[in-house]
């Protein structure tokens, strides 16, 4: 059997949701001895990067300028050490946003509710789209989908203080082309006294693993050629 190297990890720097005409940055994190990295888009070669001495990092960044719907889709990467190629990375779904129109997000019964109440978000977009997406800030990998011709419902069920936070919605023209984001709606959930004081508001930081962590090699890392990583995939 043909020998291959462990698969690299592909990530989007900052976010996988890139406004049109802005630059996307994808990171391919492989092996310290890699002499070449290839980025593939929808199965075809898209770009090549070759680290050179004295650069010694465990991966490379691919910059994709001028994001548009033709560059949105599924990316993967591979790397080479000597003559030996790695397995292909998991697929990364890169989405272009700020296409066409802006939806309106509302919440029923209102933005301030009590723990245990049933809450429903409504996302409305008058232009032709059938899929709507609801994202909570700081949790952009947890995308909820709903369908409707002009408006979609996102029933949350009985909420807890964990549902607190800022929400936005998008209309989706296809899996990889999304509308402008709606204005945010901040959901405030109050609980009983002891719960309220203990439950912190959800952070609105970007997803922690949406950052390119290309590092220098150390002796220890040489033995652990790749980080143990359980890949999550957005649109599967």
């Amino acid at each position: 059997p043909k020998q291959t190297l462990p698969k690299p990890i592909i990530r989007a720097e900052s976010t996988y949701m890139v406004p049109k005409e802005k630059q996307a940055t994808l990171c391919c994190q492989g092996s310290y001895g890699a002499v070449e990295y290839q980025l593939h888009f929808e199965g075809s070669l898209f770009a090549v990067e070759r680290p050179k001495p004295p650069e010694r990092i465990n991966g490379v960044k691919f910059h994709i300028p001028d994001m548009n719907s033709r560059k949105a889709g599924r990316y993967s990467c591979i790397y080479r050490v000597g003559e030996l190629w790695s397995e292909r990375s998991d697929l990364l779904d890169l989405v272009v946003t700020e296409m066409y129109d802006t939806p309106t997000l509302s919440v029923h019964p209102g933005p301030e509710v009590t723990s245990g109440e049933k809450v429903t978000f409504y996302c409305r977009l008058d232009t032709a789209t059938s899929m709507f997406l609801l994202l909570k800030e700081g949790r952009s990998r947890d995308v909820q989908r709903s369908y409707g011709k002009v408006q979609a419902e996102f029933p949350m069920g009985p909420v807890t203080t964990a549902h607190r936070g800022s929400y936005r919605c998008f209309g989706s023209y296809n899996n990889y082309a999304w509308s402008f984001p709606s204005e945010p709606v901040k959901l405030l959930v109050t609980g009983d006294i002891e719960n309220t004081s203990l439950a912190p508001t959800d952070p609105t930081f970007p997803d922690s693993w949406d950052t390119c962590l290309l590092t220098r090699e150390t002796g220890l890392q040489k033995d652990l050629a790749l980080w143990d990583h359980t890949a999550q995939n957005l649109l599967r």
């Epitope: 310290y32 050179k52 001495p53 004295p54 650069e55 010694r56 990092i57 290309l214 220098r216 090699e217 150390t218 002796g219 040489k222």
Partner: antibody
Framework: DVQLQESGPGLVKTSQSLSLTCSVT?????????WNWIRQFPGNKLEWVGY???????NYNPSLKNRISITRDTSKNQFFLKLNSVTTEDTATYYC??????????WGQGTSVTVSS | DIKMTQSPSSMYASLGERVTITCKAS??????LSWFQQKPGKSPKTLIY???RLVDGVPSRFSGSGSGQDYSLTISSLEFEDLGIYYC?????????FGGGTKLEIK
């Protein structure tokens, strides 16, 4: 913190060999990066001489032809420069330096070598 | 060998001034360029690598730009501690080659 220290004779006669040692503390030269010799001529011009990498492979400046050898002693965490058949043109301050971007690099303080006839 | 032509060879600038130093390669070096600072009596220190990536710990007033054959180092607001000699280094091809240096002095 990694520190590099050059040592060797300050005066060498023409046609003889120049031998310099770089002693590295606080970091293993087999862990990573590129362990370089760089020289600075009077007048401040810098020239890359060559390196030995973490895995023991070399790259040399072809201008030094077959006169150069960079080796290491991993047990002492040292690497060495040997330059044969020196001339007065080899008079310079010689630096050993660790380069490995994007890391902070580390340089020795330099050792002055004069080649005299 | 790739020849790196740096300009100016020396310059005077005032504190707070924006300073730009340029480096031109004799051929395309694919952004494999770093910038070094050497303060009087000290060893060189890397500021920038891959043309525009700042080394950890280097003040953000330093920035690099350029592509192909033409590159520049900019100090957005000159401070007294920035005086010294600045060098570019190409590492696209062996042998790595340095520019001739730019001596930066305070007016």
């Amino acid at each position: 913190d990694v520190q590099l220290q050059e040592s060797g004779p300050g005066l060498v006669k023409t046609s003889q060999s120049l031998s310099l040692t770089c002693s590295v503390t606080g970091y293993s030269i087999t862990s990573d990066d590129y362990w370089n010799w760089i020289r600075q001529f009077p007048g401040n011009k810098l020239e890359w001489v060559g390196y030995i990498s973490y895995d023991g492979s070399n790259n040399y400046n072809p201008s030094l032809k077959n006169r150069i050898s960079i080796t290491r002693d991993t047990s002492k965490n040292q690497f060495f420069l040997k330059l044969n058949s020196v001339t007065t043109e080899d008079t310079a301050t010689y630096y050993c330096a660790r380069l490995g971007y994007p890391a902070m690099d580390s340089w020795g303080q330099g050792t002055s070598v004069t080649v005299s006839s | 060998d790739i020849k790196m032509t740096q300009s100016p060879s020396s310059m005077y600038a005032s504190l707070g001034e924006r300073v730009t130093i340029t480096c031109k390669a004799s051929q395309d070096i694919n952004s494999y360029l770093s910038w070094f600072q050497q303060k009087p009596g000290k060893s060189p220190k890397t500021l920038i690598y891959r043309a525009n990536r700042l080394v950890d710990g280097v003040p953000s007033r330093f920035s690099g730009s350029g592509s192909g054959q033409d590159y520049s180092l900019t100090i957005s607001s000159l401070e007294f501690e920035d005086l010294g000699i600045y060098y570019c280094l190409q590492y696209d091809e062996f042998p790595w080659t340095f520019g001739g240096g730019t001596k930066l002095e305070i007016k």
